[in-house]
Amino acid sequence: QLPPGKPEIFKCRSPNKETFTCWWRPGTDGGLPTNYSLTYHREGETLMHECPDYITGGPNSCHFGKQYTSMWRTYIMMVNATNQMGSSFSDELYVDVTYIVQPDPPLELAVEVKQPEDRKPYLWIKWSPPTLIDLKTGWFTLLYEIRLKPEKAAEWEIHFAGQQTEFKILSLHPGQKYLVQVRCKPDHGYWSAWSPATFIQIPSDFTMND
C-alpha cells in the first residue's frame, strides 16, 4: 500500500571491455508487486534507452551485449521501481567500462616441484590468461597474484607475479601438501576470483639448504 523504496545500483562489471552487466538492490516493496526498469544515456547525449537485456545477468540486473558496449563513452544509468502507488528512482550511476573490468580467473594452473641437481629445488607455477581476454590487441595489461598455503594452515602466503604467467617459489616446508591459487586483474579494474585450488605434495627430501 506504499510506493516502492529507493533501489540502488551497487555493482557493474565487465569480463573483457566488450560486454558488461550492472546489478541493483531493490528497496522495500511497499507491500505490493513492483516492476523495475533500468534506463541509461551516454554522456553528451540526451536520448534515454532502456536496458537491452534483463535476463542474462540474473535477477535485478541489466546486461549490455557487444552492440551496446562502447569503451570510450561514459554511461549514466538509473533504476526506476514502480508499483500501483508510485515510482521511485535510484541515484544516477556513472559507468566507464574501462574501470569496471573484472576478468574471469586464470586458467590451466599447473604446479610442479622442480629439483635441479645443481640448484635449489623450487615450486614451479604456470597458468594461462582467461579466454575472454585478448592480450594481443594491447588493450589489456593483466597482473597476476599467487597465493599458497599448507593444507591445514590458516594463513595464505601471497606473491605478486606482475605480468608473467609463470612463477618460482623457493621456500616451502618439506612433506607438506600445499594449496595453490592464482588470480588476475587488469591495470584499471578489479581482481578476478581466485582460480580453483591446485594441490601439490612437497617431497620430504625437499631441502631449503644451499
Partner: antibody
C-alpha cells in the same frame, strides 16, 4: 463511519520524548497504509512518516529520520509515532491520515482532528 | 522552501472560476499522481482531488484537477464563499522517497 482520533500530544522539553497514538475505526485497518503529517503554527503541511498495512514498510521525512519511529498494532487498530530527541522545530499539530489500500493510490483520506505537540 | 511550488495566494469573486497551479519535477509530479487538499480555517485538511483528477464522493464537481508534465492545477468554478480556505497539492517524490506538499495557496473569495 471512518474515524481517526489522535492523542498523546502535549508540552515537552527539548531533547525529550513523546508518543502519539491514533485510534482508527470504521474500516479494515490492516488493509491501509497510514501516515503522520504535521503543521507548524501558521505554516503549511509537512509529511512526517508512513507505514504499510502489515507494518513492514516504513518511510520517514529526512527532518525526522533517526529520531521518530512509526509503528502500528493491527490487533488494536492503532497507529503510533514515537518521537525522541525533540527539537523546537518539531512544534506542530500532528495529524494521522489514512493512506492507500491494496489497489488504488487514494491520497490521504480521512484525517484525524490533530494533536498539538509543543517543544 | 517546499518541493512543490504553489502561488501563496489567489482570489476571485463569487461565481468566478479560479485556477491554482502546482509546479514540481520529474521525480514527483512528472512520474507520480497529484492529490489536492482543502483546509478550512481551524480544521483538519480534507482530500479534494486524488490521482490527478478524481473526486472523492461528496466533493462537488465544481472542483477539478488536471496534470501535464511536471505541473498540475486545481480549478474551482462557480466560486462560493465557503471555498475560502488553504489549498495544498501533494504527491510521492521518487527521489526523496517520501510524500511532498506544496507550500499552500490561500484562496480569498472577495
Amino acid at each position: 463511519e471512518v474515524q481517526l482520533l489522535e492523542s498523546g500530544g502535549g508540552l515537552v522539553q527539548p531533547g525529550g520524548s513523546l508518543r502519539l497514538s491514533c485510534a482508527a475505526s470504521g474500516f479494515t485497518f490492516s488493509s491501509y497504509g497510514m501516515h503522520w503529517v504535521r503543521q507548524a503554527p501558521g505554516k503549511g503541511l509537512e509529511w512526517v512518516s508512513a507505514i504499510g498495512g502489515r507494518g513492514v514498510s516504513t518511510y520517514y521525512a529526512d527532518s525526522v529520520k533517526g529520531r521518530f519511529t512509526i509503528s502500528r498494532d493491527n490487533s488494536k487498530n492503532t497507529l503510533y509515532l514515537q518521537m525522541n530527541s525533540l527539537r523546537a522545530e518539531d512544534t506542530a499539530v500532528y495529524y494521522c491520515a489514512r493512506g492507500s489500500n491494496w489497489t488504488h493510490a487514494l491520497g490521504f483520506d480521512p484525517w484525524g482532528q490533530g494533536t498539538l505537540v509543543t517543544v | 522552501q517546499s518541493v512543490l511550488t504553489q502561488p501563496p495566494s489567489a482570489s476571485g469573486t463569487p461565481g468566478q472560476r479560479v485556477t491554482i497551479s502546482c509546479s514540481g519535477s520529474s521525480s514527483n509530479i512528472g512520474s507520480n499522481t497529484v492529490n489536492w487538499y482543502q483546509q478550512l480555517p481551524g480544521t483538519a485538511p480534507k482530500l479534494l482531488i486524488y490521482g490527478n483528477s478524481n473526486r472523492p464522493s461528496g466533493v462537488p464537481d465544481r472542483f477539478s484537477g488536471s496534470k501535464s508534465g511536471t505541473s498540475a492545477s486545481l480549478a474551482i468554478s462557480g466560486l462560493r464563499s465557503e471555498d475560502e480556505a488553504d489549498y495544498y497539492c501533494a504527491g510521492w517524490d521518487g527521489r526523496l522517497i517520501g510524500w511532498v506538499f506544496g507550500g499552500g495557496t490561500k484562496l480569498t473569495v472577495l
